[in-house]
Interface confidence: low
Amino acid sequence: AIVFIKQPSSQDALQGRRALLRCEVEAPGPVHVYWLLDGAPVQDTERRFAQGSSLSFAAVDRLQDSGTFQCVARDDVTGEEARSANASFNIKWIEAGPVVLKHPASEAEIQPQTQVTLRCHIDGHPRPTYQWFRDGTPLSDGQSNHTVSSKERNLTLRPAGPEHSGLYSCCAHSAFGQACSSQNFTLSIADESFARVVLAPQDVVVARYEEAMFHCQFSAQPPPSLQWLFEDETPITNRSRPPHLRRATVFANGSLLLTQVRPRNAGIYRCIGQGQRGPPIILEATLHLAEIEDMPLFEPRVFTAGSEERVTCLPPKGLPEPSVWWEHAGVRLPTHGRVYQKGHELVLANIAESDAGVYTCHAANLAGQRRQDVNITVATVPSWLKKPQDSQLEEGKPGYLDCLTQATPKPTVVWYRNQMLISEDSRFEVFKNGTLRINSVEVYDGTWYRCMSSTPAGSIEAQARVQVLEKLKFTPPPQPQQCMEFDKEATVPCSATGREKPTIKWERADGSSLPEWVTDNAGTLHFARVTRDDAGNYTCIASNGPQGQIRAHVQLTVAVFITFKVEPERTTVYQGHTALLQCEAQGDPKPLIQWKGKDRILDPTKLGPRMHIFQNGSLVIHDVAPEDSGRYTCIAGNSCNIKHTEAPLYVVDKPVPEESEGPGSPPPYKMIQT
């Protein structure tokens, strides 16, 4: 059976606010849930949609959401269906409306001493309470011959007299909120002695140093008085003008003229008319100074032929609102065609190359004119001036590959080497004309190069093969100083490369020939058994036909390689005693001995009083401490080779003899006793 765990319930809701009708179902099999409103299925919209099994309202609408909602769960296999309890919204709302004349039937029938009834068409749920205003001042019930019927939303004036003339408005508020009349009613009951507006001043916008005119006329019997005030209630008359309004003139017909307007003249001007009876009538108008700001700069634009593009001109801030138009080559653009103005936009349809150039957006108002140019480039596909050519480049010298193209805008050129993009570094430079420079050509630069020249309109590419003309060079150059071990076999290699495979041969530097036990085998000098006489200067000569010859000089030294006669051993010493680490090496040239302790070389000149290195190479440390413990390395070296050997030194506390031990029992370590 289908069971509702949560059912929708009727609830209060606010117009335009969120709401949720909950529904949760439990069933043995899969069910699908949908909603009904007054028996009809509810379709999902952006405003009202299913959220899981529940129904969500993004903004409750008093018209579309009034009615009875029901959640329906259906098992499509068994056909079983269950319906939730009904739920509805109590929607709270308030809506503005106009103030209308209810009685008499038309304004023409309003006469002094007749009853006038106005209705406030603000509605809402719950019913709001109403407040009436005349000329912005609240009216209270039972005051000055009027009654307010809150229930009927009516204001009754009985009888209506000239003193009731004015602009009537209403506001209403309820639990939902507040609204005021969307349109107000002007009640005009003539009293000849009351001042009436004949001509009201209008807001004006003028350019600096121009003149401004405000017109103002009232009528009454007898004629009313008229007075002008500026901002701070300063009266303006032809006899007494405030300092900043020296250029103000009030005419007999009530008009006010301001000449050579300056910023300080901007503000609110009040024209006050006063009849023999009745309240003064105050009319306001504002004098604004025209202004126009600068226009923002345009970025240059690049478009492709055949496309449609738009350039928006943001008008500068200004008062009055500046008018905007586009010009090209000094001619104003039309509002239709292929290149035209639409609103503030410049539209270029099916762009042609000839559309390129400078377009100008103009903006103007009373304060002046502003203009801003936009440079439009119509991109073209690059064309070749010079393609890269298959090239032979010399190793070690700069090499150049051309990729000269032309297009609008200037094309961007990138180079690839073996399909890999070449990023500029100290070896490669792409000149602004597209030429690739290889600063110092290397053998492995011999490969395929491809250049691609692009603009927004498209790209072209071409490739070329580079062949590197190798230098005649030793690979690697022989070490200038080499050692051979006396009485042993030795080889000294020498190899070279070039455009043609070079011939390699060895000779003694003094020009003498090699002894028979020394052979020169394809550039490798081979000594079957090294003798003292084999020491000396040798020259390796590499040569080929096109490149001539190169020489490398090698000084060979014959040496007896280093061996250790005495090596240091693992040593344990009592704290405060003396440690001796022995080391003696032999070889020719006679090796020098250095010691390294605790990962640093022990400098014989900076050893201090506790340490000493003997002539034979042994290291002595007096008054040893625990921190002297560690590995000590004896390094023996001469100009031909270097060897090292190491041993640990342990520094231990001297044990206190126990009673049970005899006087002659040995210590628990292999000790050096001093």
Partner: antibody, heavy 120, light 107 residues
Framework: QITLKESGPTLVKPTQTLTLTCTFS??????????VGWIRQPPGKALEWLAH???????YYSPSLKSRLTITKDTSKNQVVLTMTNMDPVDTATYYC????????????WGQGTLVTVSS | DIQMTQSPSSLSASVGDRVTITCKAS??????LNWFQQKPGKAPKTLIY???RLLDGVPSRFSGSGSGTDFTFTISSLQPEDIATYYC?????????FGAGTKLEIK
């Protein structure tokens, strides 16, 4: 560490010839892409480029001063020499030598400058 | 010759402000533009080369951008030690030409 140092007279008479030497270390003018140039700055004024020489002896001069300038290099001594003929008081300035690396950062290294006053 | 128009010629800003200097070339100079800083009595020091590449050891608050003819140098947050005159230089072609300089002062 790359350093450049200018040397030469601090006072020159009008119509005389100025010879300035730039001695540098930390790089070699025999290395591909290396170049040395001269720039001057009259007191309180902007910088003005004078001349430039590259590792391959390629030379460039300011067009307005070309007839008066000569730039040479001595690779073995790590020196570049600038001579300027027919000196005038308007040539009073601090003269700097600079290193440039073709394809990398031009003028990344400057000498401290030497003030040359032209006065009789 | 390529003319380099640098603006503004002087500028006063507060510590922490973002400061922008521009250089306009009389023709396309590709990305070949450097920015230098010069403090009184000292040789100029290169900050940026090839429009936007920071030389080693130059603080990251300095940056450069632009292409073609319009280039911008920015200090994202001005520090007291940034008070100096700044110059741009084009090295797209000889003769090399500098901007007239922008003198930066602290308010």
């Amino acid at each position: 560490q790359i350093t450049l140092k200018e040397s030469g007279p601090t006072l020159v008479k009008p119509t005389q010839t100025l010879t300035l030497t730039c001695t540098f270390s930390g790089f070699s003018l025999s290395t591909s892409n290396m170049g040395v140039g001269w720039i001057r700055q009259p007191p309180g004024k902007a910088l003005e480029w004078l001349a430039h020489i590259w590792w391959d002896d390629d030379k460039y001069y300011s067009p307005s001063l070309k007839s008066r300038l000569t730039i040479t290099k001595d690779t073995s001594k790590n020196q570049v020499v600038l001579t300027m003929t027919n000196m005038d008081p308007v040539d009073t300035a601090t003269y700097y030598c600079v290193r440039s690396n073709y394809g990398y950062a031009w003028f990344a290294y400057w000498g401290q400058g030497t003030l040359v006053t032209v006065s009789s | 010759d390529i003319q380099m128009t640098q603006s503004p010629s002087s500028l006063s800003a507060s510590v922490g402000d973002r400061v922008t200097i521009t250089c306009k070339a009389s023709q396309d100079i590709y990305p070949y533009l450097n920015w230098f800083q010069q403090k009184p009595g000292k040789a100029p020091k290169t900050l940026i080369y090839r429009t936007n590449r920071l030389l080693d050891g130059v603080p990251s608050r300095f940056s450069g951008s632009g292409s073609g003819t319009d280039f911008t140098f920015t200090i994202s947050s001005l520090q007291p030690e940034d008070i100096a005159t700044y110059y741009c230089l084009q090295y797209d072609e000889f003769p090399l030409t500098f901007g007239a300089g922008t003198k930066l002062e602290i308010k």
